[in-house]
């Protein structure tokens, strides 16, 4: 009996609302033994892979995907999957990245911290009601 692959989780640092031109890092987490993490943008057709996997805890591994300068084109839903030989996992829940114009005002927070989509809860409701399809139909395009 092969072991079940737990659903991965995804989170964003410093948050999911990012000012234009600022950086964001998506953190994908899965079990130990993951060979490849994949960050998908809206669908399985547009993605970025990494084998730079680190151990986050005795039972968990992670990979980090950084976008140095966020543009409006980076907004949209993201999710993670991973490859633990010989199988690909299911996808994580979606995490919606929002990009906002920098207002420069002293009262406007830069980010919305603490957003993540975990493996066991109901579908995360941090996605907004409407969004444009992201790079629909492109095959194996890099995210950035």
């Amino acid at each position: 009996q092969e072991e079940d692959l737990p659903r991965p989780s995804i989170s964003a640092e410093p948050g999911t609302v990012i000012p234009l031109g600022s950086h964001v890092t998506f953190v994908c987490r899965g079990p130990v033994g993951v060979q490849t993490f994949r960050l998908e943008r809206e669908s399985r057709s547009t993605y970025n892979d990494t084998e730079d996997v680190s151990q986050a805890s005795p039972s968990e591994s992670e990979a980090r995907f950084r976008i140095d300068s966020v543009s409006e084109g980076n907004a949209g839903p993201y999710r993670c999957i991973y490859y633990k030989p010989p199988k690909w996992s299911e996808q994580s829940d979606y995490l919606e990245l929002l990009v906002k114009e920098t207002s420069g005002g002293p009262d406007s927070p830069d980010t919305e911290p603490g957003s993540s989509a975990g493996p066991t809860q109901r579908p995360s409701d941090n996605s907004h009601n409407e969004h444009a399809p992201a790079s629909q139909g492109l095959k194996a395009e890099h995210l950035y």
């Epitope: 092969e2 669908s43 399985r44 996992s89 109901r122 579908p123």
Partner: antibody, heavy 121, light 111 residues
Amino acid sequence: EQSVEESGGDLVKPEGSLTLTCTASGFSFSSGYYMCWVRQAPGKGLEWIGCIHSSSGNIYYASWAKGRFTISKTSSTTVDLQLTSLTAADTATYFCARDSEVYGWNPNDLWGPGTLVTVSS
Amino acid sequence: ELDMTQTPASVSEPVGGTVTIKCQASQSISSYLAWYQQKPGQRPKLLIYGASNLASGVSSRFKGSRSGTQFTLTITDLECDDAATYYCQCSYYGNSYVGGAFGGGTEVVVK
């Protein structure tokens, strides 16, 4: 061209059993797709039975289908739906459907033509 | 157990008219909602995915929207070819709370 096709539909007696097969072509299960079974009784609506994730092997069932219906991956290109303790209410066209290659949010955009199961004495 | 309540069961509108179909999820499903069109004797056809995104090759007369756990399919400028039954479906298979439940369907008659 990518496609899925169901087979195995038949006339079966009440309390009988049947195994339906969904055969995929033009794509690889190893990439990880949700392969789902949906049924439709004559003149009625669509009813979700369950799905198997073709790579991880994780399976999800509608609560009413648990115990009586079993989904399994039987090869790199086939998924089976085993039906047991059949009654007349199980008479339906059974569809196999795969979630999307190019769209997020896991909609089923690839459907087979369906196979008819008739339960009657 | 996830329940998808779809209304109305049937609607009749003239050519050129507008039809609005609603689907209420009994719990949060984020945007994991698809709309399908099915004609008699045919397999379902995907129209909308992710609550509001148009599938390839589908007319822009079809529009999906979401407000919390309520989802809406709007068909504008009705054509005779739009006569069919429309179904919503939760397309999330992630855990024991939700699954792929369909709404009961809406028959659209074009006069």
